[in-house]
């Protein structure tokens, strides 16, 4: 029998390379049974994750899975960084792995921090 726990299917260390100025949809794949959970996005800032309250979001329902989408219209250079979605379901908080957006600003292509630096200081992303 399939579990009716809510599950969020963002892969550990997933990343997207995108261009500033383009539209982009960041998807949080959500599996649930009967009642759709309340899902939010947050953006990592240093050691904390700051809720994105005033951003456009939407749901896309498919047969076996749903997607809670964070819209970037358009992508801005400071959208660079890591994001997590979380779901509130029956008083439980379920949190996804983080997914990282690497935004290339064609006008000012800057060097991406090395993997070693990122491991040691993940908040380098938010400079």
């Amino acid at each position: 029998k399939e579990s009716c726990d809510v599950q969020l299917y963002i892969k550990r260390q997933s990343e997207h390379s995108i261009l500033a100025g383009d539209p982009f949809e960041l998807e949080c794949p959500v599996k649930y049974c009967a009642n759709r959970p309340h899902v939010t996005w947050c953006k990592l800032n240093g050691t904390t994750c700051v809720k994105l309250e005033d951003r456009q979001t939407s749901w896309k329902e498919e047969k076996n899975i749903s997607f809670f989408i964070l819209h970037f219209e358009p992508v801005l250079p400071n959208d660079n960084g890591s994001y997590r979605c979380s779901a509130n379901f029956q008083s439980n908080l379920i949190e996804s792995h983080s997914t990282t957006l690497y935004v290339t600003d064609v006008k000012s292509a800057s060097e991406r921090p090395s993997k070693d630096e990122m491991a040691s200081r993940p908040w380098l992303l938010y400079r």
């Epitope: 240093g46 050691t47 904390t48 700051v50 983080s98 070693d116 040691s120 200081r121 938010y126």
Partner: antibody
Framework: EVQILETGGGLVKPGGSLRLSCATS????????VNWVRQAPGKGLQWVAQ??????????YYAESLEGRVTISRDDSKSSVYLQVSSVRAEDTAIYYC?????????????????WGQGVMVTVSS | DIQMTQSPSVLSVSVGDRVTLNCKAS??????LNWYQQKLGEAPKLLIY???NLQTGIPSRFSGSGSGTDFTVTISSLQPEDVATYFC?????????FGAGTKLELK
């Protein structure tokens, strides 16, 4: 008021193991990484381990000289972090400090804070 | 590992002196360096983070500078309560490492 209390120290025999606890209150523990740092009597500071928070999976990192003998863990529901040290030897004799750290960016500037407990003494001797 | 070398290891000072403490990294650590002050029998206390930023509550007579491999902390006019040991700490790459410390003692 921020409080950090390390416990679990004392006298341990060589080859034995110990588990240090760090209980915290007065700040949002979930937003903090935690370092353990130690200081042998009359010596300098040595970084031992770090555990990140759930925003970072929560990843763990260790000093190479201690790798394989130390394990750091955390229990967010208790706002606590733990350090397990196995196969202890005389050179593990030290004061062990627990230090939660946090950072965030605002208007392009890094804001960083850390707290330190008063430390707990561990003596390894037969 | 990145080695952090502090100099001098002991410095004799007088109240009112301008004091400069040095820290040298064995590799480029950009600006990922903190300074800690430790008084006898106490836990370390963060003075400066990211090379130049004064932690809240630290007097403005303390300042930090440097980049890459060479770093300094300066006390513009030493006060009696500044007598302590000062440690630099790099968090550019694993494992994090401290310098061996510079101990200030009154002449």
């Amino acid at each position: 008021e921020v409080q950090i209390l390390e416990t679990g120290g004392g006298l341990v025999k060589p080859g034995g193991s110990l588990r240090l606890s760090c209980a915290t209150s007065g700040f949002n523990f979930n937003d903090y990484f935690v370092n353990w740092v130690r200081q042998a009597p009359g010596k300098g500071l040595q970084w031992v381990a770090q555990i990140r928070n759930k925003n970072y999976n929560p990843a763990t990192y260790y000093a190479e000289s201690l790798e394989g003998r130390v394990t750091i863990s955390r229990d967010d529901s208790k706002s606590s972090v733990y350090l397990q040290v196995s196969s202890v030897r005389a050179e593990d004799t030290a004061i062990y400090y627990c230090s939660p750290i946090s950072s965030y960016y605002h208007d392009g500037s890094l804001h960083y804070s850390d707290y330190w407990g008063q430390g707990v003494m561990v003596t390894v001797s037969s | 590992d990145i080695q952090m070398t502090q100099s001098p290891s002991v410095l004799s000072v007088s109240v009112g002196d301008r004091v400069t403490l040095n820290c040298k990294a064995s590799h480029n650590i950009k600006n990922y360096l903190n300074w800690y002050q430790q008084k006898l029998g106490e836990a370390p206390k963060l003075l400066i983070y990211d090379t130049v930023n004064l932690q809240t509550g630290i007097p403005s007579r303390f300042s930090g500078s440097g980049s890459g491999t060479d770093f300094t902390v300066t006390i513009s006019s030493l006060q009696p309560e500044d007598v302590a040991t000062y440690f630099c700490f790099q968090y550019h790459s694993w494992p994090y490492t401290f310098g061996a410390g510079t101990k200030l003692e009154l002449k």
